[in-house]
Interface confidence: medium
Amino acid sequence: MNGSEYFVKIQSFLGGAPTEDLKALSQQNVSMDLATFMKLRTDAVLPLTVAEVQKLLGPHVEGLKAEERHRPVRDWILRQRQDDLDTLGLGLQGGIPNGYLVLDLSMQEALSGTPCLLGP
């Protein structure tokens, strides 16, 4: 069974998938469609790297531009370095500016909804 066929079988269970499962899926050539991606738990999507999302979505990564103002894409963008987002070649904006440090202050983030940044 190839990645695409496997994805079809598990698609209906993915809404509640944890980050670890999404990371594993990104290595299996599944080409997750955007409709499914948009239904994933925001907290599961946030830790994914740009490279992992690109692998997870396959051709559908090109559709991220259309969803950049919607959750979970919007929140995921806010967590990525702008440099990394630029590598997607989609013109996504809103990432962490170059030279900033990201502090993983869970409580701060839970209250404000955004990561805590320290300027250069």
């Epitope: 695409s4 259309a66 070649g89």
Partner: antibody, heavy 120, light 107 residues
């Protein structure tokens, strides 16, 4: 208005290489991936590959993987498709087409096509 | 690779009559399908995306339907300007693949 202007027709000998250019205007070149599709005379459409104009990353159809190279010149908003070791079956019209422009998947815009004739 | 099989190969239609083109994918592609029209000597033109949504400027006599593996393009009332070859295309996974095409002619 989105415009894709391709280079002119080429006649090549078997074994040679050809490089077709595609100059884009009317949209942000680095925000949409560029794809190449070919069509042999009287035949259907065949996807060759694409390129991320931001970092030059590409995906290729396995059928062409060792013979095709897709590149970009960001400063000139131009994409290139080079096909090597040409054979008579490569005689075709080659099209460039960006994907997902205007947030809609699919190829909404196409270049005018470049006819490449391979003949001894 | 996902194989897209189009039927029929050609279609001869009386103006004003409906036409229907079928496209079957060799595996589930969700609704990640587009349809194109190609008139003689021209580049393809996009008609439908996401299986059922018309691109702007496409006449409403064109409609698309289907999901999974079976898709249909319908022309409710064929006009003389609709002659050409119609292609389905999946963008669900690499490599992107096209159907073999259906030639529509006017009787």
């Amino acid at each position: 208005e989105v415009q894709l202007v391709q280079s002119g027709a080429e006649v090549k000998k078997p074994g040679a290489s050809v490089k077709v250019s595609c100059k884009a205007s009317g949209y942000t070149f680095t925000s949409y991936w560029m794809h190449w599709v070919r069509q042999a005379p009287g035949q259907g459409l065949e996807w060759m590959g694409n390129v991320n104009p931001s970092n030059g990353g590409s995906n290729y159809n396995e059928k062409f993987k060792n013979r095709v190279t897709i590149t970009v010149d960001k400063s000139a908003s131009t994409a290139y498709m080079e096909l090597s070791s040409l054979r008579s079956e490569d005689t075709a019209v080659y099209y460039c087409a960006p994907h997902y422009i205007g947030s809609r998947p699919g190829f909404a815009y196409w270049g005018q096509g470049t006819l490449v004739t391979v003949s001894s | 690779d996902i194989v897209m099989t189009q039927t029929p190969l050609s279609l001869s239609v009386t103006p004003g009559q409906p036409a229907s083109i079928s496209c079957k994918a060799s595996q589930n592609v969700g609704t990640n399908i587009a349809w194109y029209q190609q008139k003689p000597g021209q580049s393809p033109q996009a008609l439908i995306y996401s299986a059922s949504y018309r691109y702007s400027g496409v006449p409403d006599r064109f409609s698309g339907s289907g999901s999974g593996t079976d898709f249909t393009l319908k022309i409710s009332r064929v006009e003389a300007e609709d002659v050409g070859v119609y292609y389905c295309q999946q963008y669900n996974s690499y490599p992107l693949t096209f159907g073999g095409g259906t030639k529509v002619e006017i009787k």
